[in-house]
Amino acid sequence: MEDEKPKVNPKLYMCVCEGLSCGNEDHCEGQQCFSSLSINDGFHVYQKGCFQVYEQGKMTCKTPPSPGQAVECCQGDWCNRNITAQLPTKGKSFPGTQNFHLE
């Protein structure tokens, strides 16, 4: 994602929201959308949502994926709908190749 500076009147995007912070809502509005995967005791927990404040997501979105966590961010209405965060393949530290295959 480009390291663009926050605007004075930042554009807000509609994002899919799935996870612990969503309550009963299935969407949220923010300056960035995200899709994340975290490993909790060996179980895959997928979440989607938004960062209301640009700075809030800036560091998170730039964190490279680790064996236990991956986050992918985007800007655009519903841009996280078809994004599934993926853990890095062994020996790599970037998303794009899955560590798993659905069989």
């Epitope: 799935e18 996870g19 612990l20 969503c22 490993i39 909790n40 005791d41 060996g42 179980f43 895959h44 927990v45 997928y46 064996p67 236990g68 062994k90 560590n99 798993f100 295959h101 659905l102 069989e103």
Partner: antibody, heavy 118, light 106 residues
Framework: EVQLVESGGGLVQPGGSLRLSCAAS????????MYWIRQAPGKGLEWISS????????YYPDSVKGRFTISRDNSKNTVYLQMNSLRAEDTAVYYC???????????WGQGTLVTVSS | DIQMTQSPSSLSASVGDRVTISCKAS??????LNWFQQKPGEAPKLLIY???SLQTGIPSRFSGSGSGTDFTLTISSLQPEDFAIYFC????????FGPGTKVEIK
């Protein structure tokens, strides 16, 4: 077809050790996290361990941490559970299970019975 | 740790009945919940994952619902092969199973 076959159960004295094995087939073993779950006779289910694809990350609840060790051999398509310092309350059927990334514990083995008694 | 409770602990029903089983979490687990069926001498079998998704090969009479702390497994028309114990399972944090609900023949 996914198959998980546990072995290694039996009768062991309190304080003793046992190693369980789970032989997997029907899927690309090295691509999946694996799990052990147990069930005491007539009781509920308890998750006791998980291991990631290359064996570099392992997870345990407090009830077995420091006594049980999960490991895997991807060349043999097998996951293991080394159980030390066994107690009477560890008596249970031990199941091996696998997930797909978005479907936890989708497949289970038939289980192997471990009895800890003097 | 997140505690899971199920109600009722057992129930008696007849073939063709609509059966509902409740599972409650002690804190928010969103939809990170599965339902399993277990028959005597057998391993648990996955019925529902992610609260409401039907596992492949499971009859459509089984359905799940809920989010947050309250979840329900429904069997729309009980069949003879459905008499078993049903467990819920949460994997949001510190994976835990519910104590089970035994469905018996009336």
């Amino acid at each position: 077809e996914v198959q998980l076959v546990e072995s290694g159960g039996g009768l062991v004295q309190p304080g003793g050790s046992l190693r369980l094995s789970c032989a997997a087939s029907g899927f690309t073993f090295s691509n999946y996290y694996m799990y052990w779950i147990r069930q005491a006779p007539g009781k509920g289910l308890e998750w006791i361990s998980s291991i990631n694809t290359d064996g570099g990350s392992t997870y345990y609840p407090d009830s077995v941490k420091g006594r049980f060790t999960i490991s895997r051999d991807n060349s043999k398509n097998t996951v293991y559970l080394q159980m030390n310092s066994l107690r009477a309350e560890d008596t249970a059927v031990y199941y091996c299970a696998k997930s797909t990334p978005n479907i936890p514990l989708a497949y289970w083995g038939q289980g192997t019975l471990v009895t800890v008694s003097s | 740790d997140i505690q899971m409770t199920q109600s009722p602990s057992s129930l008696s029903a007849s073939v063709g009945d609509r059966v509902t089983i409740s599972c409650k979490a002690s804190q928010n687990i969103y939809k990170y919940l599965n339902w399993f069926q277990q028959k005597p001498g057998e391993a648990p079998k996955l019925l529902i994952y992610y609260s409401n998704s039907l596992q492949t090969g499971i009859p459509s009479r089984f359905s799940g619902s809920g989010s947050g702390t309250d979840f329900t497994l429904t069997i729309s028309s009980l069949q003879p092969e459905d008499f078993a114990i049903y467990f819920c399972f949460q994997y949001s944090s510190g994976p835990t199973f519910g104590p089970g609900t035994k469905v018996e023949i009336k």
